[in-house]
């Protein structure tokens, strides 16, 4: 995490693409994050970034569920969170949101998919009155094309961040897998 | 006071190539991405693209992929606009723009006409 | 990409009317996580560049008359010059500031009877 004072703005979300006529069913199922951006994300080449999963499960109301696993201090951690839909498909905000403390808003905007092999997710919120924003690369595999990953580089950088807020985590066996 | 300023009329030959240049003034430079706007004569505005400044990364519109490319000089805190292999239709006025993080874009240059003939 | 559609195209006025210039999208520009909006207004008077007159659907920048007024949501969106002066003769412009890309809407200018 940057602990830094100074933080990237965010782009204004005219920068921001949304994907068109996106199926929320189609995106249901696992991720890996393959890829990740933000201004609160620092690349550390001493102790680099695992690779987590993200599961989204598609609820009768049409909101997801959303599971992250990590594996952190030799076990699983699980993140749960609701996405509830926006006034677009492909948009959501947080379910609950009164029950984080210090958080005001939480935009998530699928930029762009083709559900079967790559994602790319921009996430926004104001914690404690900053903003923070993120883009993921997400894939159903651990391992995505090097034309993917320039192009979340690419995009990550047409956002305002540079090259040491971008990270490609290392992939792993624990936790993510099964 | 915040100012964007442009460079001057162009009169270029189709298959020529234009650079239009965009100063910046009276703000921090690359605090603000800067946008490129078409205006054909007599008609609406077209966005082309932008340029974050902090990264120097271009972004085109669609229609504006393949001729066109934005730069910067970011110590002479100008941008640039240039326009490869010129056609009839490249005849507009061209203008840039500063995002606001507030929303749109706040302030604009005078714009730059550009007239492509034979 | 996000169509914006404006009407009338052009509008003949008298000094001191009340005017009202109207803006669909083709979706909405609703964020429902903050309750904003993202739509602008310009004003472009000839020979002149573009004027950001309104953001955020309703919020009026900083040295605009309070004679204009940006209303409506999702879809939705009018702007209200509460008495028409001379000096506001132009095209006005809407603008969709929600996602890539920016588009405008094709303009409504407004003339003089």
């Known amino acids: 995490q940057d602990s830094t004072s100074d933080l990237i703005p965010a782009p204004p979300l005219s920068k921001v693409p949304l994907q068109q006529n996106f199926q929320d069913n189609q995106f249901q199922g696992k991720w890996y994050v393959v890829g990740l951006a933000g201004n609160a994300i620092l690349r550390e080449d001493k102790d680099p970034q695992k690779m987590y999963a993200t599961i989204y499960e598609l609820k009768e109301d049409k909101s997801y569920n959303v599971t992250s696993v990590l594996f952190r201090k030799k076990k699983c951690d699980y993140w749960i969170r609701t996405f509830v839909p926006g006034c677009q498909p492909g948009e959501f905000t947080l379910g609950n949101i009164k029950s984080y403390p210090g958080l005001t808003s939480y935009l998530v905007r699928v930029v762009s998919t083709n559900y079967n092999q790559h994602a790319m997710v921009f996430f926004k919120k104001v914690s404690q009155n900053r903003e923070y924003f993120k883009i993921t690369l997400y894939g159903r595999t651990k391992e995505l094309t090097s034309e993917l990953k320039e192009n979340f580089i690419r995009f990550s950088k047409s956002l305002g961040l540079p090259e040491n807020h971008i990270v490609f985590p290392v992939p792993i066996d624990q936790c993510i897998d099964g | 006071k915040i100012q964007l300023v442009q460079s001057g009329p162009e009169l270029k030959k189709p298959g020529e190539t234009v650079k239009i240049s965009c100063k910046a003034s009276g703000y921090t430079f690359t605090n603000y991405g800067m946008n490129w706007v078409k205006q054909a004569p007599g008609k609406g505005l077209k966005w082309m693209g932008w340029i974050n400044i902090n990264t120097g990364e271009p972004t085109y519109a669609e229609e504006f992929k393949g001729r066109f490319a934005f730069s910067l000089e970011t110590s002479a805190t100008t941008a640039f606009l240039q326009i490869n292999n010129l056609k009839n239709e490249d005849t507009a006025t061209y203008l840039c723009a500063r995002d606001s993080y507030s929303g749109g874009f706040d302030y604009w240059g005078q714009g730059t006409i550009v007239t492509v003939s034979s | 990409d996000i169509v914006m559609t404006q009407s009338p195209s052009s509008l003949s006025v008298s000094a001191g009317e009340k005017v009202t210039l109207s803006c669909k999208s083709s979706q909405s520009l609703l964020i429902s996580g903050d309750q904003k909006n993202y739509l602008a207004w310009y004003q472009q008077k000839p020979g002149q560049p573009p004027k950001l007159l309104i953001y955020g659907a309703s919020t009026r920048d900083s040295g605009v008359p309070d004679r204009f007024t940006g209303s409506g949501s999702g879809a939705d969106f009018t702007l209200t010059i509460s008495s028409v002066q001379a000096e506001d003769l132009a095209v006005y412009y809407c603008?969709?500031?929600?996602?890539?890309?920016?588009?405008f809407g094709a303009g409504t200018k407004l003339e003089l009877k």
């Open positions: 603008q969709n500031d929600h996602s890539f890309p920016p588009t």
